[in-house]
Interface confidence: medium
Amino acid sequence: MANCEFSPVSGDKPCCRLSRRAQLCLGVSILVLILVVVLAVVVPRWRQQWSGPGTTKRFPETVLARCVKYTEIHPEMRHVDCQSVWDAFKGAFISKHPCNITEEDYQPLMKLGTQTVPCNKILLWSRIKDLAHQFTQVQRDMFTLEDTLLGYLADDLTWCGEFNTSKINYQSCPDWRKDCSNNPVSVFWKTVSRRFAEAACDVVHVMLNGSRSKIFDKNSTFGSVEVHNLQPEKVQTLEAWVIHGGREDSRDLCQDPTIKELESIISKRNIQFSCKNIYRPDKFLQCVKNPEDSSCTSEI
């Protein structure tokens, strides 16, 4: 401790007086302590503090478990080595700056997850994932991206790493809007969505949410990636299914300005466009399950 000299002044109370040298020492010590605290606590947090939620809890275990489950259920993917899949997945983002991820980073994973789906049985969707998945669970010969291995592995998960460390960041990950678009999750979905759209042929279906203000949104994955990667030499028609939200909604949402915009984009790519209203999605699903039900020939 710094030396403390007691000297009587007027009155009986002692006073602790520090020498200038001691004051300087104490000041420097406090500054160093503050700096150490800042470096130890604030800087790492500041470095990792992104606007989006962090990596999903138990991310490695979840990916591995999903891979094992998928390959058991789908005989055509039984050859896949799930440990290699996880290693390739991990390699795409670990030790890399989470705002500087590229499609190339995911190529080893894409190669391992290569899968053939019937190219004329593809169902795309935008902002209505649950219904699309319910549909393909019933109509087993049709596939969304999340019915493929890679889509299934990543569905509803978040992940990112940190530059120059092998750690997974469970605190926060970059948000597409607030932080950066080239983050691990966004680049993954852009990569697999592009490949999925490129594989499509004949008639491609897309489910769109008729309850949204923009039924077709140019900034969605469908609008920004999949639409532009359908191959006109293979795809004859894109058929949109506009899903109505309200029971009493009998409007023809195929006339919506955003649907007309989609039609224009598709037509310019030399692909035909058609559109259907699904007025009663609950009945639609029920009738796909049980088409012999006589009510299934009334309007849905």
Partner: nanobody
Framework: QVQLQESGGGLVQAGGSLRLSCAAS????????MGWFRQAPGKEREFVSG???????SYADSVKGRFTISRDNGKNSVYLQMNSLKPEDTAVYYC????????????????WGQGTQVTVSS
């Protein structure tokens, strides 16, 4: 693509019968729901009857008990037996097929035939 060709239309007296046929050709490997629609002069096209791939049937109220729809999957054909015809049944009758929407929404179906004329005289 699926092509639909109707036949069996014609002129008939009120109270008489006709049997319409619709033959599907092209890509008929999938399970289409098929239906009949009609359009009278100056009126909108309306649903008459529909049948799912495995036999579920539905009818417009105006034809219930008089018309019967059936199909022969082996021949990729659907039929409409029309009995007790009335002058108000006069219209062009169209065959339609759809992969998923299961009729009857007149603007949204996948495939349409060219139509066959049915005229019922009094």
């Amino acid at each position: 693509q699926v092509q639909l060709q109707e036949s069996g239309g014609g002129l008939v007296q009120a109270g008489g019968s006709l049997r319409l046929s619709c033959a599907a050709s092209g890509r008929t490997d999938t399970r289409y729901t098929m239906g009949w629609f009609r359009q009278a002069p100056g009126k909108e096209r309306e649903f008459v009857s529909g049948i799912t791939w495995n036999g579920g049937t539905s009818y417009a109220d105006s034809v219930k008990g008089r018309f019967t729809i059936s199909r022969d999957n082996g021949k990729n054909s659907v039929y409409l037996q029309m009995n007790s015809l009335k002058p108000e049944d006069t219209a062009v009758y169209y065959c339609a097929a759809d992969r998923f929407t299961l009729v009857p929404t007149t603007s949204d179906l996948d495939y349409w035939g060219q139509g066959t004329q049915v005229t019922v005289s009094s």
